[in-house]
Interface confidence: low
């Protein structure tokens, strides 16, 4: 037989108030060991007159057939208690002398043997006739996982001999499995909740539970699925799930009802240039939904208010857009608007941004080239050209003159300032084709360069030049 | 009921630029945000690109040197464009309602050979 | 570069319970990935399951359900059929771009 218990504490050998299976002498006391998997027997007491370990008359395959079955003694079959209590059970058998070859009892779970810090112990009873083999396992504070099938194998004549299973079932409080998700929903629209509790025990309700009072006025099985008809404010929703055990609460989730985004906020100018600025925000609170883009909005500060608002749109990541196209030295108002699928958020407040100035947009006009031979120098004159308020200041001019001869190349450029409209430049190779161009500059770069002009400096005196191909309208003059 | 047909030829040839169309029925561009995807034969499903309500857009990363997608409100259509066309990009291209993958249209298969 | 995994297959018994995931390389799914579930048979165009985690689109029955498990995105066909038998593919929404799922092929036994 066997026997399984909840203890508090006791000691392994007065674990068994009734008598031992098998045939155990009143003065007898057993020899222990602790389990390992494959335990050997204890050595023989004296006045044996066949220990069990010991060798003994040959035996015939015919004659092996005939030695009496040997098996595991009937022990309980079904073990339930709760969470957290300590069990014992165990397994015998009883040896006869006949059986030469023995091997020590393992324990199994669910068909994997249970190897290293399981708590087990076996115990050794011999008498004259053979040994009695008990195999104690304990489990302290059982767990769910401790849940399932336990039994006990050992070899006997290289037979292998299995116990009958020992289940042991853990009951304990409602386990959950699936609880019921955060969502976001939109407004007065259905949408679904699940939850799953588990035992044992069996069967496991569940009460739904919005902003803290219950949703159904019966249980329902679990698993269980609410169907909420929609929300226009926001709620919390949990389940209990109860079982014979008592009561477990799943966590509160919040289910969130989906608006417009909030504006976005702290609007900056991250770089001005001419005709572009770079703009960034923080986008609002989402509204519980993802923002999907985002509407740049841009009006002429300067203009009366009927000004017209340029709109730029933009994926919703990452927070900055470059407005491009703007007219250079100008003040413009920028504000920025979010979406998501519920619709646009306001404008953030309007901030101020100002375009720098621009380079010059024409070429300086009426260029002339004039070689003079006395001083070896090309004499070059222009007309400033028209510059306008939002191409900057004019702060001077480029020239570039390159020379060209058979075999020769040379590129240079000068800059001059702003006072006057000619300059002067040394005569860098004779016999060789000079072509001069102009650019004016401002603070806000180089503008375009002047038609080229082109002048042939002779070996000797004698001189040709192309006049500007840029005279202002009604100018002819020649040199 | 909201449907989707997708339009654009069933041959190109490397290096071309595919064009491809989806119109919309029974419901507003202005209100509904179009995604394109892709499915090569025996493969898995491949976003390309989104158009949203307002007129913006979002690409795949890998892709979006070769994409282009927009929109005609007042024609209900959705256009995709890609260029530099490549026998990999063989595959059956569909569009579908944006946020809820659940209206599909039929795809139409490209093949792209010489 | 984002990758979603699916279960590359699953089998189910007729009027069984199948549960396919959806994990994203990322980290955990959240309600902000809009998962969305898309059943394909062969040669037909894909068909809307869920979005938005745990909507269900028109006319979908609902054996049909979607949630986040754990980490994951999951969707649960109960009572399965014969003609469940399809490839379903998921999609995770990051920001601003879909990336789907290389999909699950689910076969249907007997």
């Known amino acids: 037989g066997g026997t399984a218990e909840k203890w508090e504490e006791t000691e392994l050998d007065q674990l068994f108030s009734g008598p031992l299976p098998g045939r155990l002498p009143v003065n007898h006391r057993p020899f222990s060991a602790p389990h390992s998997s494959r335990d050997q027997l204890p050595p023989p007491q004296t006045g044996r007159s066949h220990p069990a370990h010991t060798a003994a008359p040959q035996v015939t395959s015919t004659a092996s057939k005939l030695l009496p079955p040997v098996a595991f003694n009937h022990t309980i079959g079904h073990i339930v208690l709760s969470e957290h209590k300590n069990v014992k059970f165990n397994c015998s058998i009883n040896i006869p002398n006949t059986y030469q070859e023995t091997a020590g009892i393992s324990w199994w779970k669910d068909g994997k043997e249970l190897l290293g810090a399981h708590h087990s112990i076996t115990q050794f009873y011999p008498d004259e006739e053979g040994v009695s083999i008990i195999a104690l396992f304990s489990i302290a504070s059982v767990q769910r996982s401790d849940n399932g099938s336990y039994f006990c194998k050992m070899k006997v004549n290289n037979r292998e001999i299995v116990s009958d299973p020992i289940y042991v079932e853990v009951q304990g409080l409602p386990y959950f499995i699936k609880q019921p998700e955060s969502v976001n929903v939109t407004r007065n629209t259905a949408f679904n909740l699940t939850c799953q509790a588990v035992g044992p025990p069996e069967p496991v309700n569940i009460f739904w539970v919005q902003n803290s009072s219950r949703v159904n006025e019966k249980p329902e099985r679990s698993p269980s699925v609410l169907t909420v008809p929609g929300l226009t404010e926001t709620a919390v929703f949990s389940c209990e799930a109860h079982n014979d055990k008592g009561l477990t609460v799943s966590k509160g989730v919040h289910i969130n009802i989906k608006v417009i985004p909030s504006p976005p906020t702290e609007v900056h100018i991250l770089n001005s240039t001419a005709h572009s600025i770079l703009v960034s925000w923080v986008p609002g609170f989402d509204g519980y939904s993802p923002l999907q883009n985002c509407s740049i909005q841009v009006k002429e500060a300067d203009r009366l208010s009927n000004g017209s608002v340029m709109v730029f749109n933009t994926s919703a990541s990452p927070h900055l857009y470059e407005i491009q196209q703007l007219q250079a030295l100008a003040n413009y108002s920028i504000a920025v608007s979010c979406r998501n699928e519920i619709g646009w958020s306001a404008v953030s407040p309007w901030i101020l941004a100002s375009t720098t100035e621009g380079a010059p947009s024409v070429a300086p006009l009426n260029i002339t080239v004039f070689l003079n031979e006395s001083n070896n120098i090309l004499d070059i004159r222009w007309t400033k050209p028209p510059i306008k308020r939002q191409d900057g200041e004019l702060v001077g001019y480029r020239i570039s003159h390159v020379w060209e001869s058979a075999g020769t190349y040379k590129e240079l450029s000068e800059e001059v300032s702003q006072n006057g409209s000619w300059a002067q430049i040394p005569v860098q190779i004779h016999n060789a084709t000079c072509t001069v161009r102009i650019a004016a500059i401002t603070k806000g770069g180089i503008g375009p360069f002047s038609e080229p002009v082109n002048i042939i400096i002779p070996e000797h005196s004698k001189v040709d030049y192309a006049p500007s191909s840029t005279p202002a309208p009604g100018n002819t003059d020649s040199m | 009921q909201v449907t989707l047909k997708e339009s654009g030829p069933v041959l190109v040839k490397p290096t071309e630029t595919l064009t491809l169309t989806c119109t919309v029925s029974?419901?507003?561009?202005?209100?509904?945000?179009i995604s394109w995807i892709r499915q090569p034969p025996g493969k898995a499903l491949e976003w390309l690109a989104v158009?949203?309500?307002?007129?913006?857009?979002d690409y795949n990363s890998a892709l979006k040197s070769r994409l282009t997608i927009s929109k005609d409100t007042s024609k209900s259509q959705v256009v995709l464009t890609m260029t530099n066309m490549d026998p990999v990009d063989t595959a059956t291209y569909y569009c579908a309602s944006h946020w809820y993958l659940d209206v599909w249209g039929q795809g139409t298969t490209v093949t792209v050979s010489s | 570069q984002t990758v979603v995994t699916q279960e590359p297959s699953f089998s189910v018994s007729p009027g069984g319970t199948v549960t396919l995931t959806c994990r994203s390389s990322?980290?955990?799914?959240?309600?902000?990935?809009?998962a969305n579930w898309v059943q394909q048979t062969p040669g037909q165009a894909p068909r809307g399951l869920i979005g938005g985690a745990n909507s269900r689109a028109p006319g979908i029955p609902d054996r049909f359900s979607g949630s986040i498990l754990g980490n994951k995105a999951a969707l649960t066909i109960t009572g399965a059929q014969a003609d469940d038998e399809s490839d379903y593919y998921c999609a995770l929404w990051f920001s601003n771009h879909w990336v789907f799922g290389g999909g699950t092929k689910l076969t249907v036994l007997g």
């Open positions: 990322t980290g955990a799914v959240s309600t902000s990935n809009y």
């Open positions: 029974g419901i507003s561009l202005s209100s509904f945000a």
């Open positions: 158009i949203w309500t307002g007129g913006g857009t």
